[in-house]
């Protein structure tokens, strides 16, 4: 299940991954030394019955339909890290791999 | 981040894990030999700003606020498998670990 990839010109209404560049400079997040911006992507779209479901559980909860369950939503199902150079709260420069920064795939869960 | 656990008597409105027993017999899924029912749990509740966010990405997308991004939703952030005995489509009996069957934790992503 590779998920769908869309862009701003797509007419796709279902759950899809869209391009998004996060710009730390524009946020004023100057404790991040590098990168100043990166391709993060995001998920958006509708989760129709059985479409792009990551887990069997998603379908089962739809079947069981408990009170308060809102149905699946379009959310990252595969994420990846990026390397970042930044100041920690002690003003030390840290170089490290930060998980959960890039959406590689979207799905319904 | 362990997530919240609730039950049907809870007054919690935020993203929370609720108990749910899935009953295969009740669904009429007779190809599943065992278990006939299991504790699956489900996620429900509101995702307020910065609450229970699994990934840094979730916060960054809220900051960047792209067109069409719906905001984070309450979804499983940790799942586990169960062992199942079932008939496959060739009517062979299979015993195996089926991933993504139990919600261990809920969060906003």
């Amino acid at each position: 299940n590779l998920g769908l990839d869309c862009d701003e010109h797509s007419s796709e209404s279902r759950c899809c991954r869209y391009p998004l560049t996060v710009d730390f400079e524009a946020f004023g997040w100057d404790w991040i030394i590098a990168p100043k911006r990166y391709k993060a992507n995001y998920c958006s779209g509708q989760c129709e019955y059985m479409f792009m479901q990551k887990y069997p559980h998603t379908h089962l909860v739809q079947q069981a339909n408990p009170r308060g369950s809102a149905g699946p939503c379009c959310t990252p199902t595969k994420m990846s890290p990026i390397n970042m150079l930044y100041f920690n709260d002690k003003q030390q420069i840290i170089y490290g791999k930060i998980p959960g920064m890039v959406v590689d795939r979207c799905g319904c869960s | 981040n362990l997530g919240l656990d609730c039950d049907e008597h809870s007054s919690e409105s935020r993203c929370c894990r609720y108990p749910l027993t899935v009953d295969f017999e009740a669904f009429g899924w007779d190809w599943i030999i065992a278990p006939k029912r299991y504790k699956a749990n489900y996620c429900s509740g509101q995702c307020e700003y910065m609450f229970m966010q699994k990934y840094p990405h979730t916060h960054l997308v809220q900051q960047a606020n792209p067109r069409g991004s719906a905001g984070p939703c309450c979804t499983p952030t940790k799942m586990s498998p169960i062992n199942m005995l079932y008939f496959n489509d060739k009517q062979q009996i299979i015993y195996g670990k089926i991933p993504g069957m139990v919600v261990d934790r809920c969060g906003c992503s």
Epitope: F24, I33, K36 | -
Partner: antibody
Framework: QVQLVQSGAEVKKPGASVKVSCKAS????????MHWVRQAPGQGLEWIGN????????NYNQRFKARATLTVDKSTSTAYMELRSLRSDDTAVYYC?????????????????WGQGTLVTVSS | DIQMTQSPSSLSASVGDRVTITCKAS??????LSWFQQKPGKAPKTLIY???RLVDGVPSKFSGSGSGTDYTLTISSLQPEDFATYYC?????????FGQGTKLEIK
Amino acid sequence: QVQLVQSGAEVKKPGASVKVSCKASGYSFTGYFMHWVRQAPGQGLEWIGNIYPYNSVSNYNQRFKARATLTVDKSTSTAYMELRSLRSDDTAVYYCARRYYYGTGPADWYYDVWGQGTLVTVSS
Amino acid sequence: DIQMTQSPSSLSASVGDRVTITCKASQDINSYLSWFQQKPGKAPKTLIYRANRLVDGVPSKFSGSGSGTDYTLTISSLQPEDFATYYCLQSDEFPLTFGQGTKLEIK
């Protein structure tokens, strides 16, 4: 466009201090390291130190640590290099330069923009 | 401190020539080496970074190579505007150190 404009030439007596300014424009001043480099007449380039304007974290060449102070004024996007107890061999052109990261590793950078230089003459 | 030894200190060449300038570090600098061009009365200009990457807008006649302790700047076909002084810089560790420069003169 990104620009660094330095203050004008200075003539100082031995033992005095000098403060050279470097005004940045065309980018987010607080988010990029500023470096200072000097060049004595007819000589090579010598690194003095750097400063990160966001939090004023700085590094110095040990040769200058006792006499040089790097500061910033975020409100005016200006970096300063002050050198105290001047000697005749401090006569040099002083440059500021912006450090630009092309990657994320600690050394993944180069100088993409330089100031025009400030000549400091130390003479009795 | 890491010592950067640049050679030759001066070089005479003609328009159209191919020239090579070398820089030797006193220890491995992991390819964290930049090359600069400086003209009289002007600030230095970065040509090459990370040993072999060309800065945007710099002509491709400039190229860099090397690893470990030994690095080279090559100018493939000299033009009148290339006569200047060239410096190397190691940025692998503090303090940053420059080579002493190579003055490229017209023959």
